[in-house]
C-alpha cells in the first residue's frame, strides 16, 4: 500500500485491488485497480 502525505496534514491511503476477470466477465487473467482508502 502506498501512503501519501498532503499539505493538509491528512494521510490518504491508496490500496491496489486485484480482481479475476472471470468474476466480472468471461476473460482470463487479473484486473488491477487502485482504491483510495480514505482519509486517516
Amino acid at each position: 500500500d502506498a501512503e501519501f502525505r498532503h499539505d493538509s496534514g491528512y494521510e490518504v491511503h491508496h490500496q491496489k485491488l486485484v480482481f479475476f476477470a472471470e468474476d466480472v466477465g468471461s476473460n482470463k487473467g487479473a484486473i488491477i485497480g487502485l482504491m483510495v482508502g480514505g482519509v486517516v
Epitope: K16, L17, V18, F20, E22, D23, V24, K28, A30
Partner: nanobody
Framework: EVQLVESGGGLVQAGGSLRLSCAVS????????MGWFRQAPGKEREFVGA????????YYADSVKGRFTISRDGAKNTVYLQMNSLKDEDTAVYYC?????????????????WGQGTQVTVSS
C-alpha cells in the same frame, strides 16, 4: 457451513520444496474463490496468492512470484500451494481462505472462510 482444512506444513531446508493442501467441504467448491495467506511471527497476515473459481487464472504476491504455484482439483475439492526455492523469510503459518465471487482477491477482508493454518519453517 464451509470448512477449510490445511495440511502439508513442516520443517524444510532453505532451497527445498513443500506442497500445502487445503481440503474444502460444506459448500459448492466451484463457486468459491480460493487464496493463500501467511503470517510470520510479529507480522500481519499477508496475501500470498489466489486462484480463480475455474482454476484458469492465478495471481501471486511479488515476494513469491516464480517460486510458488497454486492449483485446484475440483474432483477432490482441494486447493494446493506448491512452494519451491524456499527461503528463511517464507517461515510463517500458512492459511487457506475462501471468498465469494466478485470480491478483490488480494485483501484479507474479501475472505470469509479461513482454515486453521499450518506451520511452515524454513531452516538454513
Amino acid at each position: 457451513e464451509v470448512q477449510l482444512v490445511e495440511s502439508g506444513g513442516g520443517l524444510v531446508q532453505a532451497g527445498g520444496s513443500l506442497r500445502l493442501s487445503c481440503a474444502v467441504s460444506g459448500g459448492t467448491f466451484s463457486s468459491i474463490g480460493m487464496g493463500w495467506f501467511r503470517q510470520a511471527p510479529g507480522k500481519e497476515r499477508e496475501f500470498v496468492g489466489a486462484i480463480s473459481r475455474s482454476g484458469d487464472s492465478t495471481y501471486y504476491a511479488d515476494s513469491v512470484k516464480g517460486r510458488f504455484t497454486i492449483s485446484r482439483d475440483g474432483a477432490k475439492n482441494t486447493v494446493y500451494l506448491q512452494m519451491n526455492s524456499l527461503k528463511d523469510e517464507d517461515t510463517a503459518v500458512y492459511y487457506c481462505a475462501g471468498r465469494p465471487a466478485g470480491t478483490a482477491i488480494n485483501i484479507r477482508r474479501s475472505y470469509n472462510y479461513w482454515g486453521q493454518g499450518t506451520q511452515v519453517t524454513v531452516s538454513s
